[in-house]
Interface confidence: medium
């Protein structure tokens, strides 16, 4: 049970960090050429 809880926590942490990064990547792109390949 303890092991399961730890695994779930790790997965949540990873998901959260990925989401934060993804949002910040998209956020930054908005301030620049927003379709990098469409020139």
């Amino acid at each position: 049970k303890h092991k399961c809880f730890r695994k779930e926590l790790e997965e949540n942490e990873t998901l959260e960090s990925i989401m934060n990064t993804a949002e910040s990547e998209e956020e930054l792109k908005k301030y620049f050429y927003y379709l990098e390949g469409s020139k």
């Epitope: 990064t21 990547e25 956020e27 930054l28 908005k30 301030y31 620049f32 050429y33 927003y34 379709l35 990098e36 469409s38 020139k39």
Partner: antibody
Framework: QVQVVESGGGVVQPGRSLRLSCAAS????????MHWVRQAPGKGLEWVTV????????NYADSVKGRFTISRDNSKNTLYLQMNSLRAEDTAMYYC???????????WGQGTMVTVSS | DIVMTQTPLSSPVTLGQPASISCRSS???????????LSWLQQRPGQPPRLLIY???NRFSGVPDRFSGSGAGTDFTLKISRVEADDVGVYYC?????????FGPGTKVDIK
């Protein structure tokens, strides 16, 4: 050709306001984030503010937060910088720059000079 | 804020000889997308800045191949293989990895 042209600079007293404009041509203005960068006389470059391509996102340097407002009118291909509560330390050449591919400032205007003095 | 430092701050060079400018950031400029958003700008006397290099080593259109950029992480270099009279001015490195975007103090290149 691809260019941006700033206007609206001048001499203004401390505490007063000024609005700068940047007219863009030669590219699809609504596809690009746009920036203001300033340079005090004899000094280096300082990033001031940015607005996203659609105007929905803005970010400011701490030194101007709460005093300066960036905006854009994509129908007029024009970028603006509303500067309120001006201080002597805001005296600088103000450049408009396009945010280009590779997150770099790829097109710069000639600048417009703002002097804050009593 | 990410602090950018440059060395040297002044560089007297001989025409036809190489020149090198170093730029260091206070933290890594690598973003999670794997890219490093470090650019180099040239400002000739009385002129606005002009983009030379973006993403460490990519030359912007119209920039002569005498200019090259290299580096990784926190340490970057701009090299001019053979300095010409036209190259006189101030060179700035700049990071666009994280808000607020920041510039180096600039390196003044002039002819000996």
């Amino acid at each position: 050709q691809v260019q941006v042209v700033e206007s609206g600079g001048g001499v203004v007293q401390p505490g007063r306001s000024l609005r700068l404009s940047c007219a863009a041509s030669g590219f699809t203005f609504s596809n690009y984030g746009m920036h203001w960068v300033r340079q005090a006389p004899g000094k280096g470059l300082e990033w001031v503010t940015v607005i996203s391509y659609d105007g929905s996102n803005k970010n400011y340097a701490d030194s101007v937060k709460g005093r300066f407002t960036i905006s854009r009118d994509n129908s007029k291909n024009t970028l603006y910088l509303q500067m309120n509560s001006l201080r002597a330390e805001d005296t600088a050449m103000y450049y408009c720059a396009r945010g280009g591919s590779g997150f770099a400032f790829d097109i710069w205007g000639q600048g417009t000079m703002v002097t804050v003095s009593s | 804020d990410i602090v950018m430092t440059q060395t040297p701050l002044s560089s007297p060079v001989t025409l036809g000889q190489p020149a090198s400018i170093s730029c260091r950031s206070s933290q890594s400029l690598v973003r999670s997308d794997g890219n490093t958003y470090l650019s180099w700008l040239q400002q000739r006397p009385g002129q606005p800045p002009r983009l030379l290099i973006y993403k460490i080593s990519n030359r912007f259109s119209g920039v002569p191949d005498r200019f090259s950029g290299s580096g990784a992480g926190t340490d970057f270099t701009l090299k001019i293989s053979r300095v010409e009279a036209d190259d006189v001015g101030v060179y700035y490195c700049m990071q666009t990895t994280q808000f607020p975007f920041t510039f180096g103090p600039g390196t003044k290149v002039d002819i000996k």
